[in-house]
């Protein structure tokens, strides 16, 4: 059976296009298996992976993915052009930067080509699904005898990110956490020169440009204190 996916154009009578395919309507056997859920993540607004659990299918099935943007100039239905595979079965789709429009509602449609009635449509707000790269180039500056300042860089618009700094000494069993806003710097006012400190940072696309829940990976850790170089006591950028 051929299926036709129609393009939404936003008016009342054709918003059905979110749901439409041409398919037989006279079947008395109405029940079918649900499709796996599509999960999308936008990596540093450089590319997006939309993936599903292909192993949830009772038999290996090359599900197909189409997408468009709701009520926008980009509402033309697109076929996935770069499938991701798991054991030779489609398990995702990768979209490139030019195909990502953060502030338009992304509509993604998964379908079983062998059973056209198995077609589900999801709508995602991509600005809430951005995961930035981990912070880079961590550096420590000694501001005074007992005060340290940690700085880092992100490969993204800095004002869009919030950060979480963790630090601990070799004597600590757990990390101390501190939230940091878009300024990407952190000061530790009281440092014990007899202890060795470890710092790490992660970042999140929240709250100014989106409402993402997922953090980046942790940065490489940086260390300060006993055992660190004595050559320049005012600048330390030693990575583990």
């Amino acid at each position: 059976l051929n299926t036709t996916i129609l393009t939404p154009n936003g008016n009342e009578d054709t918003t059905a296009d979110f749901f439409l395919t041409t398919m037989p309507t006279d079947s008395l056997s109405v029940s079918t298996l649900p499709l796996p859920e599509v999960q999308c993540f936008v990596f540093n607004v450089e590319y997006m992976n939309c993936t599903w659990n292909s192993s949830s299918e009772p038999q290996p099935t090359n599900l197909t993915l189409h997408y468009w943007y709701k009520n926008s100039d980009n509402d033309k239905v697109q076929k996935c052009s770069h499938y991701l595979f798991s054991e030779e079965i489609t398990s995702g789709c990768q979209l490139q930067k030019k195909e990502i429009h953060l502030y338009q509602t992304f509509v993604v449609q998964l379908q079983d080509p062998r059973e056209p009635r198995r077609q589900a449509t999801q709508m995602l707000k991509l600005q809430n699904l951005v995961i930035p790269w981990a912070p880079e180039n961590l550096t420590l500056h000694k501001l005074s005898e007992s005060q340290l300042e940690l700085n880092w860089n992100n490969r993204f618009l800095n004002h869009c990110l919030e950060h979480l700094v963790q630090y601990r000494t070799d004597w600590d069993h757990s990390w101390t956490e501190q939230s940091v806003d878009y300024r990407h710097k952190f000061s530790l006012p009281s440092v014990d020169g007899q202890k060795r400190y470890t710092f790490r940072v992660r970042s999140r696309f929240n709250p100014l440009c989106g409402s993402a829940q997922h953090w980046s990976e942790w940065s490489h850790p940086i260390h300060w204190g006993s055992n660190t170089s004595k050559e320049n006591p005012f600048l330390f950028a030693l990575e583990a």
Epitope: T15, F18, S31, R117, R118, M123, L124
Partner: nanobody
Framework: QVQLQESGGGLVQPGGSLRLSCAAS????????MNWVRQAPGKGLEWVSG????????TYTDSVKGRFTISRDNAKNTLYLQMNSLKPEDTAVYYC????????GSQGTQVTVSS
């Protein structure tokens, strides 16, 4: 796994009203376009109405336009169908579904319109 539980059906006289509910679990309900479909005795499945994920776009089959209203509460993971001015030809088992022309194995809720 995906679970959909319909409720609110019953026996009603022509011209009467019912409100169907569908409680969803096992998937991210708030991202899905959802549908009501129905199956009359001895007939095939008929799509009734659909709603987009945030509830701001709805659509209906011609025979129920102006009488039925689909809505959703994403905070409660619940889909609704308000049915007014019911007619005998609305008699069917009603299902909510993430599919437009199939169900996912839910039991449905029986609506019978009869005097």
């Amino acid at each position: 796994q995906v679970q959909l539980q319909e409720s609110g059906g019953g026996l009603v006289q022509p011209g009467g009203s019912l409100r169907l509910s569908c409680a969803a679990s096992g998937f991210t309900f708030s991202t899905y376009v959802m549908n009501w479909v129905r199956q009359a005795p001895g007939k095939g499945l008929e799509w009734v109405s659909g709603i987009d994920s945030d509830g701001d776009s709805t659509t209906y089959t011609d025979s129920v336009k102006g009488r039925f209203t689909i809505s959703r509460d994403n905070a409660k993971n619940t889909l609704y169908l308000q049915m007014n001015s019911l007619k005998p030809e609305d008699t069917a088992v009603y299902y909510c579904s993430m599919f437009r022309m199939a169900t996912t194995g839910s039991q449905g809720t029986q609506v019978t319109v009869s005097s």
